[in-house]
């Protein structure tokens, strides 16, 4: 009864729910939920039944395997989907998939909040910016990675002349897409023309 | 939540019909079916019959077929039940229950609260 | 149609007490057993489907066990919400029976 999956798919796409393990032989039922009691569709060894539900049009089920085909996700099919087979024996097994449908990330600006000089050393800060999304910052000076420490939407540091950059790339990423953003300075300290 | 809403008690003379209604929320209407049980004063459960929201399909106790006719309404999510030719013997609670599937498994998983239903002269 | 048979018809029992409810299918039925329980005046409640498996939101002091032609219901530890009227039911084929209920009474 236990079974629980994590997906994680970019908007847009087609997903395929399915389990990793062959269905239970003969069964009697095969039923999809989203939540529970929301039903989307089931097969009863006669034909599939597909409820209204804002899935309808967009689903299709493979009694064969049980998979589930979904197309065109949005974030809003963000839920804990289930499937539940009925077998001839009347015991039940269930299997729970949990579906996260991300956005593909925007491209980020890089806002440069302060840059000065200072007895040869450079005082950088720089800030990433994208609109309000849940995603990972990667700065990197001239493609090396910053320190794991300075990795968050804002980039505070202060630079010496053996470790100058002359552009800084901010990259902004969650589990489906990544996209960067670069400044370039011309040394010692001022921001390049672009 | 799910919920299944029975309609109110009825008095009935010998031979006339009754129409009970079992309105249900919280779920996929079509995507059950809808069992009924009655209950005699005293007495234990006996299954009447089952009726799929999905298309209609229904399957009745032998001892009432002919006199019962089960049907649904799924642009309000409500189950009918209606018994002919009553009986004194047909007083009893009259319940709905959701079975989990739409085609019948037989499993009820939600009951409605019952309606009492006397058959008096 | 097959017949299901609850022993003891009544049970006296305390709080705290393990209190077991036999069920006998007149033909075997596999795993395709529920069990329900009623309070006076109020509509049944499932507890148990397919011989084993709890309902949503039933405390996991009720446990149901069994195949074929032999079911058990248990109640390890009985709670004074508990004392009540407890029905197996088969669902392997039309028409669906009842067993005729076992009462939980306090002792």
């Known amino acids: 009864q236990g079974h629980l999956v994590h997906m994680t798919v970019v908007s847009g796409s087609n997903v395929t729910l399915n389990i990793s393990e062959s269905l239970p032989e003969n069964y009697k039922q095969l039923t999809w939920f989203y939540t529970f009691d929301q039903k989307i569709v089931e097969w009863d060894s006669r034909k599939s039944k597909y409820f209204e539900s804002k899935f309808k049009g967009r689903v299709r089920l493979d009694p064969q395997s049980g998979a589930l085909y979904i197309s065109k996700v949005q974030k809003e099919d963000n839920s804990t989907y289930i499937m539940r087979v009925l077998k001839k024996t009347g015991n039940e097994q269930e299997w729970k998939i949990k579906l996260q449908v991300l956005d593909p990330v925007p491209k980020p600006v890089i806002k440069i909040e302060k840059i000065e000089d200072m007895d040869d050393n450079c005082y950088l800060k720089l800030s990433c910016v994208i609109p309000g999304e849940s995603v990972n910052y990667t700065w990197y000076g001239d493609k090396r990675p910053f320190p794991k420490e300075l990795q968050n939407s804002v980039l505070e540091t202060t630079l010496m002349p053996h470790n100058y950059s002359r552009c800084y790339t901010c990259q902004v990423s969650n589990s489906v897409s990544s996209k960067n953003g670069t400044v370039c300075l011309s040394p010692p300290c001022t921001l390049a023309r672009s | 939540q799910v919920r299944l809403v029975e309609s109110g008690a009825e008095v009935k003379k010998p031979g006339a019909s009754v129409k009970v209604s079992c309105k249900t929320s919280?779920?996929?209407?079509?995507?059950?079916?809808i069992t009924w049980v009655r209950q005699a004063p005293g007495r234990g459960l006996e299954w009447m019959g089952w009726v799929s929201a999905y298309n209609g399909d229904t399957d009745y106790a032998q001892s009432l077929q002919g006199r019962v006719t089960m049907t649904t309404d799924t642009s309000t999510s409500t189950a009918y039940m209606e018994l002919r030719s009553l009986r004194s013997d047909d007083t009893a609670m009259y319940y709905c229950?959701?079975?989990?599937?739409?085609?019948?498994?037989?499993?009820?998983?939600?009951w409605g609260q019952g309606t009492l239903v006397t058959v008096s002269s | 149609d097959i017949v299901m048979t609850q022993s003891p018809s009544s049970v006296s029992a305390s709080v705290g007490d393990r209190v077991t409810i036999t069920c006998r299918a007149s033909q075997g039925i596999s795993s395709w057993l529920a069990w329900h329980q009623q309070k006076p005046g109020k509509a049944p409640k499932v507890l148990i489907y397919?011989?084993?498996s709890l309902h949503s939101g039933v405390p996991s002091r009720f446990s149901g066990s069994g195949s074929g032609t032999e079911f058990t219901l248990t109640i390890s530890s009985l709670q004074p919400e508990d004392f009540a009227t407890y029905y197996c039911?088969?669902?392997?084929?039309?028409?669906?029976?009842f067993g005729q209920g076992t009462k939980v009474e306090i002792k």
């Open positions: 039911q088969q669902a392997n084929t039309f028409p669906y029976t």
């Open positions: 919280g779920y996929t209407f079509a995507g059950y079916g």
């Open positions: 229950a959701r079975d989990r599937y739409s085609s019948s498994s037989g499993y009820f998983d939600y």
């Open positions: 397919a011989a084993s």
